[in-house]
């Protein structure tokens, strides 16, 4: 669809005569008839196949035709067509004299014709005007013409329909050749597909408008590259959607079992050391001066027997005070005023004088200690037990009671954590300095390989009645482990017994 436009510019008929040579009375009141038709090698009369148009009286004898496209659209003349422009045409322009006001062909005498021109040729669609001038013996006509496409039609032949739009069906404008030019943020054949936020994950994200990034179920974040843990997960994360991989110190299917009570609850008071000893279980090792399960009770400061050489201890508000026996002084009765002459060494200790007899030192036999050999040796004072083992005096000897996971005389040997096969689903166990690590086979994850991760035959939840689904990774098939009271390959048939569910 398009329009052939003809712009009449000037008509010269200086003598004011008709084609017959007869003069017009009083002058030639001139109007034009235009016939547009298909290309003919020799332009002949006949139907105006592409259209026809007439003008009103435009002037008398010789006149210029002003551009009147704004006021009524009579010049340029418009010859619309509703077909593919063929690229060739024939054009007949007739100038007629109007003696009266009726310009219909049947109302005019046949000799009212002033002049007739006929042209033919090629004409491509375009914005540029072709200027032409046709001269006869008595008249001259100057005009220009062009073919342009109608609104929403494009291309060399005005055959390509394109209507710009910005709605559900497309977001585009039209290029001069009729091809679509997508509005910013849209793509696709009809510009219906939004361009998502840059970086939006191709599989996990999508968008319904440009620069958006909406996540598919199980994914989150600005670019939909972070998973969402399982609905029931409490203290865990994920690497694929709906997983529950436990944070440090938590265990169980939904990471709700507290394996690190010490860190999560800090139960030990007064600077005591906390040791985890199982789920929700712990042991507090108290600092001197404290006792109780959580080291919450303060001991009397005298309970640690701070007074030496037989001094007696008295509790005070701000500490304690030692009352020293004769011959001793100092905060803890640690200084002696005796000499070897006073036989100060007990339990067979031998006395050696120092500083010209001003004081002395006792050399104690085995199993005795103290400045006067007055104490039996406590073999546990040197903390010989490693890895938190508890030291016990046993007469002349000592022994270590080891914490779980350790053995040896001094609890110096680490019992393999892997001995109890803690890794599920065929995971490989590795002993570490302070625990173990499981390397999981394909399709499993979690601290103990307890979480199934593969997208497998069980993903479609084929098992009924709360049955547990297992995937055979070698064949990509599933097996349903039926709860009590159900049978069938998918546990779909009740066996007539009341079902029992492990709530």
């Amino acid at each position: 669809s398009g329009v052939f436009q003809l712009q009449l510019q000037e008509f010269i008929n200086e003598r004011g005569v008709l084609a017959s040579g007869r003069p017009c009375e009083p002058g030639c009141r001139t109007f034009f008839r235009v016939c547009l038709k298909h290309f003919q090698a020799v332009v002949s009369p006949g139907p105006c196949t592409f259209g026809t148009v007439s003008t009103p009286v435009l002037g008398t004898n010789s006149f210029a035709v002003r551009d009147d496209s704004s006021g009524g659209g009579r010049n340029p003349l418009q010859l619309p067509f509703n077909f593919t422009w063929p690229g060739t045409f024939s054009l007949i322009i007739e100038a007629w004299h109007a003696p009266g006001d009726d310009l219909r062909p049947e109302a005019l005498p046949p000799d009212a014709l002033i002049s007739k021109i006929a042209i033919q040729g090629s004409l491509a669609v375009g914005q540029n005007w072709l200027l032409d001038e046709q001269t006869s013996t008595l008249t001259r006509l100057r005009y220009s013409y062009r073919v342009i496409c109608s609104d929403n039609y494009y291309g060399d032949n005005c055959s390509r329909l394109c209507k710009k739009r910005n709605d559900h069906f497309g977001h585009y404008v039209c290029q001069p050749d009729g091809n679509l030019s997508c509005l910013p943020g849209w793509t696709g054949e009809y510009c219906q597909q939004p361009i998502c936020l840059s970086g939006c994950h191709e599989q996990n994200g999508y968008c319904s408008k440009p620069a958006e990034c909406l996540c598919r179920p199980g994914w989150q974040g600005r670019l939909c590259n972070e998973c969402i843990p399982h609905n029931g997960c409490r203290h865990g994360t994920c690497s694929t959607p709906w997983q529950c991989t436990c944070d440090e110190g938590w265990g169980g299917l939904f990471c709700d079992q507290d394996l690190n009570y010490c860190t999560h609850h800090s139960p030990c008071k007064n600077g005591a050391t906390c040791s985890n000893s199982g789920q929700r279980s712990y042991t507090c090792t108290c600092r001197p001066g404290y006792t109780g399960v959580d080291c919450e009770l303060e001991l009397s400061e005298c309970d640690s027997n701070p007074c030496r050489n037989g001094g007696s201890c008295k509790d005070q508000e701000d500490g304690y005070h030692c009352l020293c026996p004769p011959g001793y002084y100092g905060l803890h009765c640690e200084h002696s005023t005796l000499s070897c002459a006073d036989s100060p060494c007990f339990n067979g200790g031998s006395c050696r004088e120092r500083n010209q007899g001003a004081n002395y030192a006792c050399e104690c036999p085995p199993n005795f200690t103290g400045s006067n050999c007055e104490k039996k040796v406590d073999r546990c004072t040197s903390n010989p037990c490693a890895n938190g083992g508890q030291c016990l005096n046993r007469g002349p000897s000592r022994m270590c009671r080891c914490r779980p996971g350790f053995t040896g005389t001094y609890c110096e040997l680490h019992v393999s954590d892997c001995a109890r096969n803690p890794c599920a689903h065929g995971g490989t166990c590795h002993d570490l300095e302070n625990g173990l690590m499981c390397t999981c086979p394909a399709g499993f994850s979690g601290r103990r390989c307890e979480v199934r991760t593969s997208i497998d035959a069980c993903a479609s939840s084929p098992c009924f009645n709360r049955a547990t689904c297992y995937t055979d990774l070698s064949t990509d098939t599933f097996v349903c482990n039926c709860p009590y009271g159900f049978v069938g390959s998918r546990c779909e048939f009740p066996v007539g017994l009341p079902p029992s569910f492990p709530w």
Partner: antibody, heavy 118, light 107 residues
């Protein structure tokens, strides 16, 4: 035990503001996306806003966009909803919930009533 | 936005009855559907997710089925504590949307 406790609701005039809080416990708050869901008196449930756990990305229903702001403080295990330019149609019980716009809402708080009226 | 339509809007039944509530989505939501139970003055509680998975601690008398656009919640044998309002919710498309609710009352 998972617990979500909302606070901050009350009576406010149209055009006014309120800030709702939700204190979370019993789970590692920073690991999970959170949401606000509301329920007008005698009506059904309506999702309001969501915030991711990973990077704090936020999403809102069209009717509250530009007026409401969802945020979180992982160090305090607390979720917030700042509500400005309140309208009568915002009157509802507001529930804090654990979930995203593309996952079920697994846990819910007891709700806090917001009444917008002159 | 996806419209979720529940039927019936209300339902009377007796203890021990088998009850079915349906939920229809205006377009395909695959299996991304959840069911919630809400009692007067209380918060909703997740019953079922991904169409047919029971949430932690939910009794086995509750079950879900369906896919695409048509879904069902079934209570095999009503207990006194089951009288409540039930909502379905889709989380396949943004934004998430809920059904209008089905009120289950004692006959």
């Amino acid at each position: 035990e998972v617990q979500l406790v909302e606070s901050g609701g009350g009576l406010v005039q149209p055009g006014g503001s309120l800030r709702l809080s939700c204190a979370a416990s019993g789970f590692t708050f920073s690991n999970f996306p959170m949401a606000w869901v509301r329920q007008a008196p005698g009506k059904g449930l309506e999702w309001v806003a969501t915030i991711s756990s990973s990077d704090g990305t936020t999403y809102y229903r069209d009717s509250v966009k530009g007026r409401f702001t969802i945020s979180r403080d992982n160090s305090k295990s607390t979720l917030y909803l700042q509500m400005n330019s309140l309208r009568a149609e915002d009157t509802a019980v507001y529930y804090c919930s654990r979930g995203y716009y593309n996952s079920p809402f697994a846990y819910w708080g007891q709700g806090t009533l917001v009444t917008v009226s002159s | 936005d996806i419209q979720m339509t529940q039927s019936p809007s209300s339902l009377s039944a007796s203890v021990g009855d088998r009850v079915t509530i349906t939920c229809r989505a205006s377009e395909d939501i695959y299996s991304n559907l959840a069911w919630y139970q809400q009692k007067p003055g209380k918060a909703p509680k997740l019953l079922i997710y991904d169409t047919n998975n029971l949430a932690d601690g939910v009794p086995s008398r509750f079950s879900g089925s369906g896919s695409g656009t048509d879904f069902t919640l079934t209570i095999s044998s009503l207990q006194p504590e089951d009288f409540a309002t039930y909502y379905c919710q889709q989380y396949n498309n943004y934004p998430p949307t809920f059904g209008q609710g089905t009120k289950l009352e004692i006959k």
